[in-house]
């Protein structure tokens, strides 16, 4: 669809005839039809393929044609056409005296024409005025003519329909020769899809506008590239959505149990080393000179009776001095200058030599020890209670008073609180130093998962065609991930192939 | 009122040449077209051609050309036929008719010239 | 050349019956979405006298019962109440392409 544009310019009959040569009184009123038709070698009668136009008039004799095109007047004139332009055409152009105001054909007197005349050629859909001038022996005619495309009309010979939309059909303006021109942040054949943020990602992300990037079902980030783990995972990760992967140090289905106390308190004082020994549980090994369950007691190094044979023990910056009794030396007061002459065994303790009576060694009756059976025993001095237990002497024995949560004889054993399986619908208990936790199966909660919550919605497979499933626990449902070629909830269905349905 | 006027009757000898006028008054003669058509006795109708009166362009029927001329005098507002090297199948009715380039066909047509050619 | 073929040869419709000329093209008479299809009357012993042009616009002074149709290459005529003065030889004739043809021609008379 095209518009043939017709410009006159001017006209020349400065004698004011006739083409009969008769001339017109008072001078010729002149105005002009215009035929166009198709190619043809030579112009022939028959219909104006292409289209007619007739002027009103337009000047009388000699006159030249204002260009009337701002006022929507009729120079140049309009030939539309609703076709693929040829780029060959046949021009009729005549010019007619109208002596009255009526220019029909029949209204005219028999000799009206003035002039005609007859061009055929090839003309290319453009902008440019191609401009000519047709001579009889009384007339001149000058004029230009072009052809261009409709509104929404483009190429060679205006055969390409494009009309610029900013819509859901598609974001594009039209290129000279037709083709689309996509609007910024929009690409496709049709400009209808969307350009999303710079670095979205290509699976888990989409967008329905320009620099987007809304994320797909299990997917976070302003990329789209980071998962969402499972709800209510506190010391853990995932790689694929709805994982729960534990850092390290951490336990159970949402990682959030210790299995690094050490690392996590350093319950450990004054230098202590801490060893993990469970689920919150662990063991202080204390420096010298230290004690209690977190070596948070500072010991003096004589509460150890380091010296030997009734030496009496002083503290010092540094560690400690041994004053030793008469007939004894050594840092202990551990060698003797006595033999058992001087009967150095107390509390019925026997004495043998030894070394060829240079030395002697004291055999002591039982609640009785030392070098020289001087100490009456206390069970105590070892320090045997574990996990804090207080050591009380009673008489020839010793009892250790343990802290809460332990037992045995040296305390040595932890009280089991779950000894009674308080954990129901199959949760595992664990002992922690002042009561227990449990660890509960997937779709129970509570402090003894006495709590039905959700179910594992992946457990019965539910997606198909190596579809991967994720489980959203905090709707009960699960999200089916489809591969390249499947659709549906379940991804089901190949992509182009309607379902079809048993019923 | 729009008028074709044609030429009398004519007979002829075959191989001599005949020349029919047509003259029209009524209406601008070299704005139109004039056709040539030829209608043998008791058989239909044949084109043989035109020519415009404005510029003298001709078209033939290939089964005609090289024995028929079209000419114009718009001082006269008449057109002319030649048909030469008669043969005795040229017997038959001519006419003129007008045309124009707006199409709206031979819209008037002269009555008719009967060349009758006999030895 | 293009080779226009008319039926039928003869006609007989009673006065005021419609009457239907058909004229078949050996190829399409059709350009720029215009039939280049003319009808034409002739009476004897007169010149024919055009009735249609363009495949269905009417002449000059052609009455109302005179209609034509068709396009590409199957055209028709049709009078539409057949009247005394009617009787005559209807041709069709295309313009497409030189050299013009003419149908072989229709009679038309009275039943």
């Known amino acids: 669809s095209g518009v043939f544009q017709l410009q006159l310019q001017e006209f020349i009959n400065e004698r004011g005839v006739l083409a009969s040569g008769r001339p017109c009184e008072p001078g010729c009123r002149t105005f002009f039809r215009v035929c166009l038709k198709h190619f043809q070698a030579v112009v022939s009668p028959g219909p104006c393929t292409f289209g007619t136009v007739s002027t009103p008039v337009l000047g009388t004799n000699s006159f030249a044609v204002r260009d009337d095109s701002s006022g929507g007047g009729r120079n140049p004139l309009q030939l539309p056409f609703n076709f693929t332009w040829p780029g060959t055409f046949s021009l009729i152009i005549e010019a007619w005296h109208a002596p009255g105001d009526d220019l029909r054909p029949e209204a005219l007197p028999p000799d009206a024409l003035i002039s005609k005349i007859a061009i055929q050629g090839s003309l290319a859909v453009g902008q440019n005025w191609l401009l000519d001038e047709q001579t009889s022996t009384l007339t001149r005619l000058r004029y230009s003519y072009r052809v261009i495309c409709s509104d929404n009309y483009y190429g060679d010979n205006c055969s390409r329909l494009c009309k610029k939309r900013n819509d859901h059909f598609g974001h594009y303006v039209c290129q000279p020769d037709g083709n689309l021109s996509c609007l910024p942040g929009w690409t496709g054949e049709y400009c209808q899809q969307p350009i999303c943020l710079s670095g979205c990602h290509e699976q888990n992300g989409y967008c329905s506008k320009p620099a987007e990037c809304l994320c797909r079902p299990g997917w976070q980030g302003r990329l789209c590239n980071e998962c969402i783990p499972h709800n209510g995972c506190r010391h853990g990760t995932c790689s694929t959505p709805w994982q729960c992967t534990c850092d390290e140090g951490w336990g159970g289905l949402f990682c959030d149990q210790d299995l690094n106390y050490c690392t996590h308190h350093s319950p450990c004082k004054n230098g202590a080393t801490c060893s993990n020994s469970g689920q919150r549980s662990y063991t202080c090994t204390c420096r010298p000179g230290y004690t209690g369950v977190d070596c948070e007691l500072e010991l003096s190094e004589c509460d150890s009776n380091p010296c030997r044979n009734g030496g009496s023990c002083k503290d010092q910056e540094d560690g400690y001095h041994c004053l030793c009794p008469p007939g004894y030396y050594g840092l202990h007061c551990e060698h003797s200058t006595l033999s058992c002459a001087d009967s150095p065994c107390f509390n019925g303790g026997s004495c043998r030599e030894r070394n060829q009576g240079a030395n002697y060694a004291c055999e002591c009756p039982p609640n009785f020890t030392g070098s020289n059976c001087e100490k009456k025993v206390d069970r105590c001095t070892s320090n045997p209670c574990a996990n804090g237990g207080q050591c009380l002497n009673r008489g020839p024995s010793r009892m250790c008073r343990c802290r809460p949560g332990f037992t045995g004889t040296y305390c040595e054993l932890h009280v089991s609180d779950c000894a009674r399986n308080p954990c129901a619908h199959g949760g595992t208990c664990h002992d922690l130093e002042n009561g227990l936790m449990c660890t509960c199966p997937a779709g129970f909660s509570g402090r003894r998962c006495e709590v039905r919550t959700s179910i594992d919605a992946c457990a019965s497979s539910p997606c198909f065609n190596r579809a991967t499933c994720y489980t959203d626990l905090s709707t009960d449902t699960f999200v089916c991930n489809c591969p390249y070629g499947f659709v549906g909830s379940r991804c089901e269905f190949p992509v182009g192939l309607p379902p079809s349905f048993p019923w | 009122q729009v008028q074709l006027v044609q030429s009398g009757a004519e007979v002829k000898k075959p191989g001599a040449s005949v020349k029919i006028s047509c003259k029209a008054s009524?209406?601008?003669?070299?704005?139109?077209?004039i056709h040539w058509v030829k209608q043998a006795p008791g058989q239909g109708l044949e084109w043989i051609g035109y020519?415009?009166?404005?510029?003298?362009?001709?078209n033939y029927n290939q089964k005609f050309k090289g024995r028929v001329t079209f000419t114009t005098d718009t001082s006269t507002s008449t057109a002319y036929m030649e048909l030469r090297s008669l043969r005795s199948d040229d017997t038959a009715v001519y006419y003129c008719a007008r045309d124009y380039d707006y199409d709206v066909g031979m819209d008037y047509w002269g009555q008719g010239t009967l060349v009758t050619v006999s030895s | 050349d293009i080779v226009m073929t008319q039926s039928p040869d003869s006609l007989a419709v009673s006065l005021g019956e419609r009457a239907t000329i058909s004229c078949r093209a050996s190829?399409?008479?059709?350009?720029?979405?215009?039939?280049?299809m003319k009808w034409f009357q002739q009476k004897p012993g007169q010149p024919p006298k055009l009735l249609i042009y363009a495949a269905s616009n009417q002449g000059s002074g052609v009455p109302d019962r005179f209609s034509g149709s068709g396009s590409g290459t199957d055209f028709t005529l049709t009078i539409s109440s057949l009247q005394a003065e009617d009787v005559a030889v209807y041709y069709c004739?295309?313009?497409?392409?030189?050299?013009?043809?003419f149908g072989g021609g229709t009679k038309v008379e009275i039943k």
């Open positions: 020519i415009s009166s404005y510029n003298g362009a001709t």
């Open positions: 009524g209406y601008s003669f070299t704005a139109y077209y």
């Open positions: 004739q295309q313009s497409k392409e030189v050299p013009w043809t």
């Open positions: 190829e399409s008479v059709d350009n720029y979405g215009i039939s280049f």
